[in-house]
Interface confidence: low
């Protein structure tokens, strides 16, 4: 028989988690699970325990997470990478839609995410949606096309800027812009 | 809220021992992982060595590995800092640091200043060759 198969790790509330706030890390295996071994990418920081609580996130806990269980003398393969960033580490860019927040059904919008300092990448979320749009740019003028909107690209968004060299220590996150679609 | 008291510094000869003691108020001891820091004018806080809550693991940094160790006495709400074979180049402010409930509690290694809540005012320790 193989490996066992492999647990899930969580990020409760969220993975994305502002500098002094609490979240908790949650590894879910099968039921009778016997041992966790819940850990830290590229440090020599684990625990034995499914679920780990940090009460108030700091910078040196951002980064990649991964666990994996024991079932008598069998290891399961590891879970899925967690990236754990840590937010507001820098102050925020600002969010702008070009040419404006409000566009037609099958037209054309670019949001565009600036910031002061000199990072090279940026992230973009909408309200809802679990994953950011990440753009790498020379130039500390991110710019995400929306070519032909229809209604689903309407919402809340916002972005973050940080640097290649720290990828887990993202800047608060801009003032929230909304699309209208019309 | 906690406050950190440190004390035991002094002017001691290269070759001598010390003994600082960091005691917190307003909350026990064993409830905090405690941590000691030490920074020399002019150069950047560094690492020393960190006790858990249960004092059940210690670490210490390359640099004082074999003759500084940290213990703590919950019953007496202290955390020690035992200083031997002192070098004048420990000479620095020591300062404690609690951390009210440090993620990955035993496996704590390297310690790092922003993972801790609470600082004390530091004591001088200066060690003349």
């Known amino acids: 028989s193989g490996p066992l198969p492999k647990p899930s790790l969580q990020a409760l509330p969220s993975s994305l988690v502002p500098l002094e706030k609490p979240v908790t890390l949650r590894c879910q295996g099968p039921p009778g699970v016997d041992l966790y071994r819940l850990e830290k990418l590229s440090s020599s920081r684990y625990q034995d325990q499914a679920v780990l609580f940090i009460p108030a996130m700091k910078r040196s806990l951002a980064g990649r997470y991964r666990c994996s269980y024991q079932n008598g003398s069998l290891w399961s393969l590891p879970s899925d990478q967690l990236e754990l960033v840590a937010t507001g580490v820098f102050a925020k860019p600002s969010l702008s839609a070009q040419p404006g927040p409000a566009v037609s059904s099958g037209g054309d919008v670019t949001l565009q995410c600036q910031t002061r300092y000199g990072f090279d990448q940026f992230a973009l979320y909408k309200e809802g949606d679990p994953a950011p749009y990440k753009n790498p740019e020379r130039w500390y003028r991110a710019s995400f096309p929306i070519i032909t909107v229809t209604a689903a690209h309407s919402g809340t968004y916002r972005c973050y800027s940080f640097s290649s060299r720290d990828p887990y220590l993202w800047s608060a996150p801009s003032d929230p812009l909304e699309l209208v679609v019309t | 809220q906690v406050q950190l008291q440190e004390s035991g510094g002094g002017l001691v000869q290269a070759g001598g021992s010390l003994r600082l003691s960091c005691a917190p108020s307003g909350r026990t001891i064993s409830s905090v992982d405690v941590g000691w820091f030490r920074q020399a004018p002019g150069k950047e806080r560094e690492f020393v060595a960190h006790?858990?809550?249960?004092?059940?693991?210690?670490y210490a940094a390359d640099s004082v590995k074999g003759r500084f160790t940290v213990s703590r006495d919950n019953a007496k709400n202290t955390v020690y800092l035992q200083m031997n074979s002192l070098k004048p180049e420990d000479t620095a402010v020591y300062y404690c640091?609690?951390?009210?409930?440090?993620?990955?509690?035993?496996?704590?290694?390297?310690?790092?200043?922003?993972?801790?809540?609470?600082w004390g005012q530091g004591t001088q320790v200066t060690v003349s060759s």
């Open positions: 640091a609690a951390a009210l409930n440090g993620a990955f509690r035993d496996s704590w290694y390297p310690a790092l200043w922003d993972e801790y809540d609470y």
């Open positions: 006790v858990t809550w249960s004092g059940g693991s210690t």
